[in-house]
């Protein structure tokens, strides 16, 4: 029978006797930076080439006994998870291994850097097809390791890394914290976060998604036909590296941004029990478990978007937080969130020729998050239209006035500390979907985009009585690009997108009272691209 | 011991070929920064990655490394260049005393310096 982990990542339509065709991932080369490996193990024989690269520190302790099978254990298992003939994800992928971890599973940042440089030089000397680099290791936050990962990613290499096994914020570790790297947390057969002794999988905004990482059957270095079960975020990352190899083999031209968006899009949503994570990390941690796409082609027509959270701004009066999209992505909307509710909104602004999302803390606030909605929108031309605070009681409004531009997101930002708590809510005049409306003391920012075949619509869900959370979702075939609250009153903690649902959070109802002030409306902007759909149909 | 002699020889050569003082002082207003692992047990003091500014060429990286060795030797410190980076990041890996960090941060082309640290199988 199929091991639980392979079944979990396999869409139902694939599930037959045989998990996958034997050549899945055959156009892709996966580099593994790990321990030494037993490359003649029957599970990986002929699939893994051991390079002559080795950069490891000496083992600790004078009494350490170097036993080959122990030295090879971690790397052999991971190579098997990626491409093993029986228990591998991408059975056709070829691999190259670099030894950067010693027999105790320990390496150095510098050794890893030299390994990444070796990969880049190999790529330049002999360009092959798509490359995936698996980094099943973690150390403390390292600026230089993150920078090297960024450079390699910008050279077209897909990097996949373990989130870390420290039951901690992945942003405190490298390469997990590098934005260009696909960072993977671990879940078990019950889709719960993996506990490892007193610790467990890392979590937080630096994790892109989770994947099976407990009781994973794979090649054992104890003998050439042995199998063993291992657990950890390394195993989870190996699954995603295998899935990435499968996807790149089917569509070799996929960019890193496209691959990441597809990984997120095809993941199982909302299956992880978030109670395992610390309360302050739940909203930041993606509730996604990786899976193979239901079919290798035909995803191109979709408008893909993902949510990117900033680091926390910190509590100072003028503190701000910035969320950025990847280079090939468009920022289609910007929202903000504060647990205390004390914030001064958010705005989209240009930084280095690219739009970023900046959130502003308020006096007495514990800090804010900026939340960017980052989308793949080819040939897009987006701009931000701003309306300063209006003096009229009707509130501030701004719309997309350029021909062919559609509204993809609304943001509001205010300088006053308290945004008119006692003023009645401002409601959007009906029949004006291309318009952002906000509080009269706030400046309003509309994200307006022109792209072939792009169409968007506004969807609202209002609740008259106070409620901690109001949601509105885009229907099938439409993608959530914008998420905001109407009105921008003080008891709203903020708004953010979770998959295709816009979530507006309010202060605890017990402290709000049930006046009209409690009314909250969640506003979603849902878009689709007819152009992408047509292009896809023509291909098929 | 052989290694150390080799290093010393290299240093003498570097001393002879290097002009005195800082020929290329760092650009005004840009200060290189020092980074180290926040998790103390994972730190590896004594080995440092010197990262140079983005457009630095390999020859400049080598020259900067040699300059560091020469200036360190003048102060009575032995250093060893373990690796010169190029292809991903310009810079070099150096084994040296932490006492030399202030000196190294003032070298031309230096963007930042990071103390080496451990990584672990997950």
């Amino acid at each position: 029978s199929i091991p639980w982990n392979l079944e979990r990542i396999t869409p139902p339509r694939y599930r037959a006797d045989e998990y996958q065709p034997p050549d899945g991932g055959s156009l892709v080369e996966v580099y593994l930076l790990d321990t030494s490996i037993q490359s003649d193990h029957r599970e990986i024989e002929g699939r893994v080439m051991v390079t002559d690269f080795e950069n490891v520190p000496e083992e600790d302790g004078t009494r350490f006994h170097r036993q080959a099978s122990k030295c090879d254990s971690h790397g052999t298992h991971l190579a098997g998870v990626v491409s093993g003939r029986d228990a591998g994800v991408a059975k056709g992928a070829s691999m190259r291994s670099l030894r950067v971890l010693n027999c105790q599973g320990k390496g150095t940042v510098s050794g890893t850097l030299i390994g990444l440089e070796f990969i880049r030089k190999s790529q330049l000397v002999q360009p092959v097809g798509p490359l995936v680099v698996l980094l099943p290791l973690a150390g403390g936050y390292s600026r230089v390791l993150n920078a090297a990962c960024q450079r390699l990613a910008r050279a077209g290499v897909v990097l996949v890394t373990a989130a870390g096994n420290f039951r901690d914020d992945a942003c405190l570790y490298s390469p997990a914290s590098a934005p260009e790297v696909i960072t993977v947390g671990a879940t078990n057969a019950q889709d719960q976060p993996v506990t490892l002794g007193t610790l467990g999988t890392n979590f937080g905004r630096c994790v892109d998604l989770f994947a099976p990482g407990e009781d994973i059957i794979g090649a054992s270095s104890d003998c050439s036909t042995c199998f063993v079960s291992q657990s950890g975020t390394s195993q989870a990352a190996a699954h995603v590296a295998g899935i990435a190899a499968m996807m790149l083999s089917a569509e070799p031209e996929l960019t890193l941004a496209e691959l990441r968006q597809r990984l997120i899009h095809f993941s199982a949503k909302d299956v992880i029990n978030e109670a395992w994570f610390p309360e302050d990390q739940r909203v930041l941690t993606p509730n996604l478990v990786a899976a193979l796409p239901p079919s290798t082609h035909g995803a191109g027509w979709q408008l893909f978007c993902r949510t990117v959270w900033s680091a926390h701004s910190g509590p100072t009066r003028m503190a701000t937080a910035v969320a950025r999209c990847a280079p090939d992505e468009e920022l289609l909307s910007c929202s903000s969130f504060s647990r205390s509710g004390k914030r001064r909104g958010e705005r989209m602004e240009a930084q280095g020729g690219k739009l970023v999302c900046r959130a502003h803390n308020a006096f007495g606030g514990e800090g804010v998050y900026a939340i960017a909605r980052c989308c793949l929108l080819p040939q897009a031309n987006c701009s931000v239209h701003t309306a300063p605070p209006a003096e009229a009681s009707m509130g501030t409004r701004v719309h997309c006035h350029q021909q062919g531009h559609v509204l993809t997101g609304c943001s509001s930002h205010w300088e006053v500390e308290d945004l008119g708590t006692h003023k009645p809510p401002v409601l959007r005049p009906r029949g004006q979907p291309n318009q952002c409306v906000g509080h009269r003391e706030a400046s309003i920012h509309a994200s307006c985009c022109h792209a072939p075949g792009l169409e968007c619509k506004v969807k609202e869900h209002g609740i008259p009585a106070p409620q901690e959370q109001v949601t509105v979702a885009c229907e099938e075939g439409w993608t959530l690009t914008g998420c905001s609250a109407l009105p921008g009153t003080s008891h709203v903690l903020g708004a953010y997108a979770v998959d295709n649902t816009c979530v507006v959070r309010s202060r605890d109802v017990s402290t709000t009272g049930s006046t009209s002030e409690g009314a909250v409306t969640a506003v979603a902007i849902c878009c689709r691209s007819r152009h992408l759909a047509q292009a896809s149909q023509e291909l098929q | 011991q052989e290694d150390e002699d080799g290093d010393y020889e290299e240093l003498v050569l570097a001393l002879r070929s290097e002009e005195d003082g800082l020929a290329e002082a760092p650009e005004h207003g840009t200060t290189a920064t020092f980074h180290r692992c926040a998790k103390d047990p994972w730190r590896l003091p004594g080995t440092y990655v010197v990262v140079l500014k983005e457009e630095t060429h390999l020859s400049q990286s080598e020259r900067t490394a040699r300059r560091l060795q020469a200036q360190a030797a003048r102060r009575g410190y032995l250093t060893k260049i373990l690796h010169v980076f190029h292809g991903l990041l310009p810079g070099f890996l150096v084994k040296m005393s932490g006492d030399l960090l202030e000196l190294a941060l003032k070298l031309p082309h230096v963007d930042y310096i990071e103390e080496d640290s451990s990584v672990f199988a997950q």
């Epitope: 006797d17 045989e18 037993q38 003649d40 024989e45 002929g46 080439m49 003998c223 050439s224 | -």
Partner: antibody, heavy 115, light 107 residues
């Protein structure tokens, strides 16, 4: 190119031992072990076992346990198969092949056991 | 051990004929089946691995199919150099086991 070259034919008496060698070239030996397969005259193929260049690990067919020993010498890229206490039904052509996949074969070594 | 049964044990055919050889496993071997060609006095040569994959250098007239317990090797248009003995081999379990062979002779 990738090839396996075996030692020459052997004639042995019953009860004796034979050691057949197989020299690998043209590929990274550590990435594959060596399988040994034999074929008695006019018969089919029989897998005897596998040996690793990487760490010397072995995997023997049950029928061979105790009588056969497979070893490797990575320094010369050579694998060896020794068969002891030879019997007349050990008369066969002995082949080495690359790995469990057996995608490359040696030319074969004829071992004749006759009194 | 898994038993492999080939049929027919021999067949006569002419150049240009389409030839089919079947192989049955005593239990499911998924798609872990290889086919070898052996000419008199020569070592076997891998023709097909994993039921249907042709290694580079093997002519396209050779094809393999099947999964589970029943497998087929097809030579779409028999050539003079194809007269040989063909063996199937399961690669699912250790020890690997071979079929008894199918001899393809000139009619």
């Amino acid at each position: 190119q990738v090839q396996l070259v075996q030692s020459g034919a052997e004639v042995k008496k019953p009860g004796a031992s034979v050691k057949v060698s197989c020299k690998a070239s043209g590929y990274a030996i550590y990435n594959y072990g060596i399988s040994w397969v034999r074929q008695a005259p006019g018969q089919g193929l029989e897998w005897m076992g596998w040996v690793s260049f990487y760490n010397g690990n072995t995997n023997y067919a049950q029928k061979l346990q105790g009588r056969g020993t497979m070893t490797t010498d990575p320094s010369t890229s050579t694998a060896y198969m020794e068969l002891r206490s030879l019997r007349s039904d050990d008369t066969a052509v002995y082949y080495c092949a690359r790995g469990y996949v057996m995608d490359i074969w040696g030319q074969g070594t004829t071992v004749t056991v006759s009194s | 051990d898994i038993q492999m049964t080939q049929s027919p044990s021999s067949l006569s055919a002419s150049v240009g004929d389409r030839v089919t050889i079947t192989c049955r496993a005593s239990q499911s071997i998924n798609n872990w089946l290889d086919w070898y060609q052996q000419k008199p006095g020569k070592a076997p040569k891998l023709l097909i691995y994993a039921a249907s994959t042709r290694p580079s250098g093997v002519p396209s007239r050779f094809s393999g199919s099947g999964s589970g317990t029943d497998f087929t090797l097809t030579i779409s248009s028999l050539q003079p150099e194809d007269f040989a003995t063909y063996y199937c081999q399961q690669d699912q379990d250790i020890p690997p086991t071979f079929g008894q062979g199918t001899k393809v002779e000139i009619k």
